[in-house]
């Protein structure tokens, strides 16, 4: 009923941008974007007691205010400030799990290990996960046809700036031991150009964060290499050490068993290396 009230109150009509308007290289706004964001907000605030007082209508107003009527290649972090503020969330700062190029496993892990949090376990990350959105300069329309691609069009687009902003704040809030899950199957296990490598690494606060612990997830069944010795991991260690944060690394040789052992830590087979 909360959602119905919100839509009845404003009777928003979201028109598609006509096809003859500027075509971007990326996919357009996710269909039913306003409804999806509001529905997710209502669901999240119902489930998470610490966010129950959040007004989802205000959250949506702040979200749309960040990109509606603005050129989709000229979005700034400042545009998202009201949304970031309304989505302020106190997560246990020593229970943060960052990830790079291995989102699904990270999310499977926090679904089992309920006291740890990825960005997508917070309100703002949950609202935007897997969605695309953009508007158009000087019109109140949402562009459902196409949105700027980060590489082919511009980096300061609504989606990229959102994730950069929210990732920075998430990293800034971390403390003690921070974990990061990295994909050992990729040519660059640590990629300086990923959100983790370009934003989160540089916004961990050395006065609060003692250690960054990397979990390198192996892909092949028979892969017994020590991927913690990979040159890109050494590069990550160097960046972190220069920031006066300690670094440690663990190989997760069998991610399936790893998840199983998180679910059932008493299992006798879980004492050996995973």
């Amino acid at each position: 009923s909360g959602l119905n009230d919100i839509f009845e109150a404003q009777k928003i009509e979201w028109h598609e941008v006509p096809r003859w308007r500027q075509q971007w290289s990326g996919p357009g706004t996710t269909k039913r974007f306003p409804e999806t964001v509001l529905a997710r907000c209502v669901k999240y605030t119902e489930i998470h007691p610490e966010m129950r007082h959040v007004d989802c209508q205000s959250v949506w107003d702040a979200f749309k205010g960040a990109f509606i009527s603005k050129h989709p290649c000229n979005i700034t972090e400042e545009d998202y400030q009201p949304l970031m503020k309304l989505g302020t969330q106190t997560v246990p700062c020593n229970k943060i799990l960052l990830w790079s190029r291995i989102k699904d496993l990270a999310h499977q892990f926090t679904q089992v290990q309920r006291d740890m949090f990825t960005l997508e376990d917070t309100l703002l990350g949950y609202l935007a996960d897997d969605l695309t959105w953009c508007g158009e300069f000087n019109t109140s329309k949402i562009n459902y046809q196409s949105c700027p691609d980060w590489r082919k069009d511009c980096s300061n687009n609504p989606v990229s700036v959102f994730w950069k902003t929210v990732s920075r704040r998430f990293a800034e809030a971390a403390c003690d031991v921070v974990h990061v899950m990295l994909n050992g199957s990729r040519s660059k296990i640590f990629d300086k150009n990923s959100t983790f490598g370009s934003v989160e690494v540089h916004n961990l606060q050395p006065e609060k964060v003692q250690t960054l612990e990397a979990w390198v997830i192996h892909g092949g069944r028979e892969d017994s290499r020590d991927l913690c010795q990979d040159p890109t991991i050494k590069e990550l260690e160097s960046i972190i050490s220069k920031r006066n944060i300690q670094f440690s690394c663990k190989n997760i040789y069998r991610p399936d068993k790893f998840l199983q052992c998180v679910k059932n830590p008493e299992d006798s087979s879980c004492t050996s290396e995973i």
Partner: antibody, heavy 123, light 110 residues
Framework: EVQLLESGGGLVQPGGSLRLSCAAS????????IIWIRQAPGKGLEWVAA?????????YYADWAKGRFTVSKDNSKNTVYLQMNSLRAEDTAVYYC???????????????WGQGTLVTVSS | DIQLTQSPSTLSASVGDRVTITCRSS????????LAWYQQKPGKAPKLLMY???NLASGVPSRFSGSGSGTEFTLTISSVQPDDFATYYC??????????FGGGTKVEIK
């Protein structure tokens, strides 16, 4: 110089309404959150409502203020308002408007305050 | 509801004394350190002293310092001056951008 000036306080009967104003000067009004905070006589501070208007109004309230209190803004007059309805004796307080520090590293703190306006709810 | 508890509620001190005020929050503040301290004198609005637990606001003398994280914070005046006799409030910032203030600590002349 940053200045915030509240007005509109006074004596009102229980169940009555009052509209407070907060006139701002000396800064770019649209770029800051303005927060209403109150202080009952001899008591501590309590936040009431917040508003920010970069394009449209974005506002939110303390749980206890939802439904009775409404915050709004007139950008042409550089003024924020607090409409208070169904007033009770326990709403008697000095009402301050304050400007929040700007920038994500500083949000959540109040760097500039008005002098306050006293609201007395009594029959 | 979030509770911020300050202790003591009143504190008597002499000029030159070292004074410490404690603030405890019923929930962890945002970012583990999103807590401010204000000074208020009778009939005046509060004045920001410290933000993010340990950062001195502009123009505040260095005899003021803050520390703590999570739920426990302290404000210290290393050597109380005549101008410091006032009431001090802590203020936390929490999920959903909500704010809470402590009940205040009055620092009076012994």
């Amino acid at each position: 110089e940053v200045q915030l000036l509240e007005s509109g306080g006074g004596l009102v009967q229980p169940g009555g309404s009052l509209r407070l104003s907060c006139a701002a000067s000396g800064f770019s009004f649209n770029n800051y959150w303005i927060i209403w905070i109150r202080q009952a006589p001899g008591k501590g501070l309590e936040w009431v409502a917040a508003i920010y208007s970069p394009s449209g109004d974005i506002k939110y309230y303390a749980d206890w203020a939802k439904g009775r209190f409404t915050v709004s803004k007139d950008n042409s007059k550089n003024t924020v308002y607090l409409q208070m309805n169904s007033l009770r004796a326990e709403d008697t307080a000095v009402y301050y408007c304050a400007r929040e520090l700007s920038g994500s590293s500083y949000e959540g703190y109040f760097e500039s305050w008005g002098q306050g306006t006293l609201v007395t709810v009594s029959s | 509801d979030i509770q911020l508890t300050q202790s003591p509620s009143t504190l008597s001190a002499s000029v030159g004394d070292r004074v410490t005020i404690t603030c405890r929050s019923s929930q962890s503040v945002y970012g583990h350190n999103w807590l401010a301290w204000y000074q208020q004198k009778p009939g005046k609005a509060p004045k920001l002293l410290m933000y993010r637990a340990s950062n001195l606001a502009s123009g505040v003398p260095s005899r003021f310092s803050g520390s703590g994280s999570g739920t426990e914070f302290t404000l210290t005046i290393s050597s109380v001056q005549p101008d410091d006799f006032a009431t001090y409030y802590c203020q936390g910032y929490y999920s959903g951008a909500s704010y809470a203030f402590g009940g205040g600590t009055k620092v009076e002349i012994k």
